[in-house]
Structure formats: structure tokens, C-alpha cells
């Protein structure tokens, strides 16, 4: 029979034949011939492949470096590799997460939108009229100006984005 | 580890059979192709058999096809080889190896076979 | 069917010399899928070279091939008294027949 110039989902084309790939969690060792089938080998310990693949070497796991702020998030299998996150008030810099830096913190005048992840930095926002925020801080949200009404009090001082409202009693010689 | 272990040799006389086996172990033996090879006293490697993994194809040398039958058997890991009509000139160390695409990668020790009157 | 001529014969040499050794095809060889055994009295050969350069597993690197098409060549840089032995060559990729070459006897001079 003519040699195949194309092989099946699976297969590879080595020497004008169609050889198995070997599956996620194994190496090549060896290509098939007419007569044995490719000769794959189980990745080592810290080693990975996560594809159908014809690789001679498997890849390391990633190390996550404790010096780079970097913790486990999932351990490594033979098919997978190691996902790393950051520390507690860490993020990370990049998809890969190959090193963390510190969550931002929000001025005042700005408040938190969205709580940091060990993937994704703090989001803050400016607080909208009503609402202050007069710390810097990776976690608090603007905070609703006080209502002195409710209070049975005027308001003194006007807040701003970055201080609430001052309250006072109400000026009886206006009543 | 990875070892194949030819036996069945002996002296025979002319015309008659005699069947080698070969027990392979350390390694996957229903994955691999394997051969027999012999070798004649004072002489160089002749090649002889080869049997696919799983048993569907053979090949022979000329010089015992019709005669040899190789087999295998994948649950008891052996490959055999079946010589009827036995020659003179088929007194040889007989070897099984593995087959692979960097070629004979393990042999077995041999078995050595006479024919003689 | 390919045949594998190998020479010299017989190659006299001393402990720590260079040997070289050939091996030509009648004609070219598939995919370079050439390997050379060592063979020692009483032992089974052994696998030194496949695809005509690659060393298999635990083989010192004194021993290296090389060549394509019909010429090949095995080269033992420097002679250790373990390598005095019987060399073969053999094309693993135009089958039927797998060929053997005649042998190259490498002795102590």
C-alpha cells in the first residue's frame, strides 16, 4: 500500500508512517515501526505533559517561590501543571503568575469596587456624591455620608468625597 | 528489569521439529514487534522471523519460510518459534530480541540448536 | 533486498588506538535506520548506535556513528581492553529481509 501522507486524530506521521501519540502524562521514548507500537513512558515525579503529544521530555511542574510571595493553589499531576497563587494581600503581576506584588490600596476620596484576589488587583472607584471615604485601604468601600435628619441635626459642614458630614443641633431661634 | 530468556534448543535429528520459546519480562510484551535472529557456529547474525505486537503480521526469511511458524502468546508474555523440517544448516544459536525503532534494543541469551544424524 | 559489505575483516589494533569501521549498503538506506551490535564470544549482541549516530542507553561516548545513504561508519575513539569484540551492522528499515552485514573482528595486535 501507498505510504500516508496524512494520520488520524491521535497519530503523527514519522517515516512514512502513522504512529499513536503518546497520551497526557507520558513521553516518547521510541517511534512505532510496522511491527510495535510507540513506546511511551509515565512523566517523573514534579513532571508533566497535558496534551497527545510526541515529546522525548516532560515538562517541570512550576515552582512556586515562596521568595516571590507565591504559594500552591493546585498541585501538579503528571498531567497538569502546578497553578500558583499569591500570599494573603498578595496578587499576581501577570496570567502566568510568576511573581506577586502587594495589593494597591485606595486613597481616601476613593473607595474599594472589588476586593483583591490572589489574581487580581484591588479596583477602586471615586466615591460618588453621598458617599466618603477618608482612609487608605486595600478593603473599605465609600461610606454613605451621615444624615444628621435622621438624627433630629443639621448638617454643619458639608462632606466631601474624602469627609462625611459634619452634624450640629438645629438653630432654635430659626424655629 | 527488562529480559527475554530463549529455551527449547537441543539436538534433533534431520526432518524433525523442535519449538524455542522466548519469555520476555520488565516491559510491556503486547506492545512490541519481535524477532528471532540466529547465528551459526563460527558465523555472522541471520535474521530469520519478525512478528507484529499483536500477532496479525509475519515475516520470514527465505531460507526457512515454509518450515518456521513464529507466534506469540500475549498472556503468557513468550514468543515461539515452530521449526518443522529441520536441516543440517539450521544448527545455530537461536535469539529472540525485541523490536523497536531504534532497532534489536534487548536480546536474549540464545538457545542453541544441532541437527544432526 | 539490501546487502551490507563491512570492512575491514579483521582490524589489529592496541588498547588506547582510534578504530574506525565501515559499513556499505547496496543502495540507500531508509530514514538512515542503520545500527551497529558488539558482540563478545558466548554473549548475545548488544545495540551500540541506531539511526546511524544516536548511542543507545548506557553506551560510553568513545563510541560514535555516522554516514547516510550506503556509507556508514562506527569509530571507537580510544581502544579499551572491554571492546575487543565482533561489529555488526544491520539496516532495521527495508524489510523483509532485515540484513546483517558480515562483521568487523576487532582484536588485540
Known amino acids: 500500500p501507498e505510504p500516508p501522507t496524512a494520520c488520524r486524530e491521535k497519530q503523527y506521521l514519522i517515516n512514512s508512517q502513522c504512529c499513536s501519540l503518546c497520551q497526557p502524562g507520558q513521553k516518547l521514548v521510541s517511534d512505532c515501526t510496522e511491527f510495535t507500537e510507540t513506546e511511551c513512558l509515565p512523566c517523573g515525579e514534579s513532571e508533566f505533559l497535558d496534551t497527545w503529544n510526541r515529546e522525548t521530555h516532560c515538562h517541570q511542574h512550576k515552582y512556586c517561590d515562596p521568595n516571590l510571595g507565591l504559594r500552591v493553589q493546585q498541585k501538579g499531576t503528571s498531567e497538569t501543571d502546578t497553578i500558583c497563587t499569591c500570599e494573603e494581600g498578595w496578587h499576581c503581576t501577570s496570567e502566568a503568575c510568576e511573581s506577586c506584588v502587594l495589593h494597591r490600596s485606595c486613597s481616601p476620596g476613593f473607595g474599594v469596587k472589588q476586593i483583591a484576589t490572589g489574581v487580581s488587583d484591588t479596583i477602586c472607584e471615586p466615591c460618588p456624591v453621598g458617599f466618603f471615604s477618608n482612609v487608605s485601604s486595600a478593603f473599605e468601600k465609600c461610606h454613605p455620608w451621615t444624615s444628621c435628619e435622621t438624627k433630629d441635626l443639621v448638617v454643619q459642614q458639608a462632606g466631601t468625597n474624602k469627609t462625611d458630614v459634619v452634624c450640629g443641633p438645629q438653630d432654635r431661634l430659626r424655629a | 528489569q527488562v529480559q527475554l530468556v530463549e529455551s527449547g534448543g537441543g539436538v534433533v535429528q534431520p526432518g524433525r521439529s523442535l519449538r524455542l520459546s522466548c519469555a520476555a519480562s520488565?516491559?510491556?510484551?503486547?506492545?512490541?514487534?519481535m524477532h528471532w535472529v540466529r547465528q551459526a557456529p563460527g558465523k555472522g547474525l541471520e535474521w530469520v522471523a519478525v512478528?507484529?505486537?499483536?500477532?496479525?503480521?509475519?515475516y520470514y526469511a527465505d531460507s526457512v519460510k515454509g518450515r518456521f511458524t513464529i507466534s506469540r502468546d500475549n498472556s503468557k508474555n513468550t514468543l515461539y518459534l515452530q521449526m518443522n523440517s529441520l536441516r543440517a544448516e539450521d544448527t545455530a544459536v537461536y535469539y529472540c530480541?525485541?523490536?523497536?525503532?531504534?532497532?534489536?534494543?534487548?536480546w536474549g541469551q540464545g538457545t542453541m540448536v544441532t541437527v544432526s544424524s | 533486498e539490501i546487502v551490507l559489505t563491512q570492512s575491514p575483516g579483521t582490524l589489529s589494533l592496541s588498547p588506547g588506538e582510534r578504530a574506525t569501521l565501515s559499513c556499505r549498503a547496496s543502495?540507500?538506506?531508509?530514514?538512515?535506520?542503520l545500527a551497529w551490535y558488539q558482540q563478545k564470544p558466548g554473549q548475545a549482541p548488544r545495540l551500540l548506535i541506531y539511526g546511524a549516530s544516536s548511542r543507545a542507553n548506557g553506551i560510553p561516548d568513545r563510541f560514535s556513528g555516522s554516514g547516510s545513504g550506503t556509507d556508514f561508519t562506527l569509530t571507537i575513539s580510544r581502544l579499551e581492553p572491554e571492546d575487543f569484540a565482533v561489529y555488526y551492522c544491520?539496516?532495521?528499515?527495508?524489510?523483509?529481509?532485515?540484513?546483517f552485514g558480515g562483521g568487523t573482528k576487532v582484536e588485540i595486535k
Open positions: 520488565g516491559f510491556t510484551f503486547e506492545k512490541y514487534g
Open positions: 530480541a525485541r523490536d523497536t525503532s531504534r532497532g534489536h534494543d534487548i
Open positions: 512478528i507484529s505486537y499483536e500477532g496479525e503480521k509475519k
Open positions: 544491520s539496516d532495521y528499515a527495508d524489510y523483509p529481509p532485515f540484513t
Open positions: 543502495q540507500s538506506v531508509s530514514y538512515s535506520y
